[in-house]
Amino acid sequence: PPRGRILGGREAEAHARPYMASVQLNGAHLCGGVLVAEQWVLSAAHCLEDAADGKVQVLLGAHSLSQPEPSKRLYDVLRAVPHPDSQPDTIDHDLLLLQLSEKATLGPAVRPLPWQRVDRDVAPGTLCDVAGWGIVNHAGRRPDSLQHVLLPVLDRATCNRRTHHDGAITERLMCAESNRRDSCKGDSGGPLVCGGVLEGVVTSGSRVCGNRKKPGIYTRVASYAAWIDSVLA
């Protein structure tokens, strides 16, 4: 089943997010991803936890998952590199780099997204864009077309309240508000984009969606710049 968590959002403008990837297992959408280099897609490590024997592929240039589109192309994965410290039972270090079988054919609908290298928190209240093909309601309806929502960043101290995430949010994670608008199941691994720069990746822990007391949790890419650079090198 798809992992992670867009509720309360709307359909994205087609191909306006050319960095957006669908990580697929046996031909079905599993998680979001983001093209960070010509041959590399960044996603969440937990996405591949249950993918042991399945065929993992990456869809780029897509708006609709099912309809033919000139820019769409499915790439095989040459190498999957989860963060070495990621573990099944924690949300920490939930990053995965997927090396495509070949360099992506770039164009208006397929283009890498610059990612944040300066390890400084995004200011609370900043509106950031999260997109994905994750479920759009509590009944679990999966969209065919890419959805997105703008979410305000939430400060870490609030996010760490006992009623919220009770101390689980380290400096390597960030939160965004989740009051009816939220990332949801199937959005994991997708990008949180602030000011046109990739700041976070949707974590793939199981979490209730759209509840203001359970904010969305995102892995801060700037905190993993050294690791990302070392894998891409």
Epitope: P124, R156, A157, T158, N160, R161, R162, G167
Partner: antibody
Framework: QIQLVQSGPELKKPGETVKISCKAS????????MNWVKQAPGQGLNWMGC????????IYADDFRGRFAFSLETSASTAYLQINNLKNEDMATYFC????????WGQGTTLTVSS | SIVMTQTPKFLLVSAGDRVTITCKAS??????VAWYQQKPGQSPRLLIY???NRYTGVPERFTGSGYGTDFTFTINTVQAEDLAVYFC?????????FGGGTKLEIK
């Protein structure tokens, strides 16, 4: 290990000002709000409010608006409670406690108000 | 403000007894209730959070239950070291109000 260490006992006169400190160690100070709790002699616990250590924004319970102020010295990982124009009813033990991620309390600061 | 009405105020029990303390919230606080123990001259100590979760290192004889407005805290087999005052607290919304406390005395 995680610790909250409060300043020592205070003896003040009515009308004076007191500032109680709560120094945190063993964790990233700005990751957790700090609560302040009042306990009058022989009485129960009274949540005064809290301060968001990340943004600096305080929240005060209704009974603690006006003469009471929470502040931070982030570089020293320290939260402060200041009480102005002290009254006899302010005589109590004041506790700081970390909000979330476990159970961490200061040892308490006893304030005596006497003319 | 949400009022937390805690009963009883005092309990006189013998070692080995089962003790039940209740807290009633003036409006729903879902499961956002904690229970604290405070021994004389000490800071409060968290025993139960989210109404029923036992905090790390807390003995199994301490249990909590409830949802919405009605909450119960139980000590299954009271021991001499349980002499203390017990408080409930709601952290559903600010102000994060406490109950009035229950003083537990051992015969």
């Amino acid at each position: 290990q995680i610790q909250l260490v409060q300043s020592g006992p205070e003896l003040k006169k009515p009308g004076e000002t007191v500032k109680i400190s709560c120094k945190a160690s063993g964790y990233t100070f700005t990751n957790f709000e700090m609560n302040w709790v009042k306990q009058a002699p022989g009485q129960g616990l009274n949540w005064m409010g809290c301060i968001n250590t990340y943004t600096g924004d305080p929240i005060y319970a209704d009974d603690f608006r006006g003469r009471f102020a929470f502040s931070l010295e982030t570089s020293a990982s320290t939260a402060y409670l200041q009480i102005n124009n002290l009254k006899n009813e302010d005589m109590a033990t004041y506790f700081c406690s970390r909000e979330g991620g476990g159970d961490y309390w200061g040892q308490g600061t006893t304030l005596t108000v006497s003319s | 403000s949400i009022v937390m009405t805690q009963t009883p105020k005092f309990l006189l029990v013998s070692a080995g007894d089962r003790v039940t303390i209740t807290c009633k919230a003036s409006q729903s606080v879902t499961n956002d209730v904690a229970w604290y123990q405070q021994k004389p001259g000490q800071s409060p100590r968290l025993l139960i959070y989210h109404a029923s979760n036992r905090y790390t290192g807390v003995p199994e004889r301490f249990t909590g239950s409830g949802y919405g407005t009605d909450f119960t805290f139980t000590i299954n087999t009271v021991q001499a070291e349980d002499l203390a005052v017990y408080f409930c607290q709601q952290d559903y919304s600010s102000p994060r109000t406490f109950g009035g406390g229950t003083k537990l005395e051992i015969k």
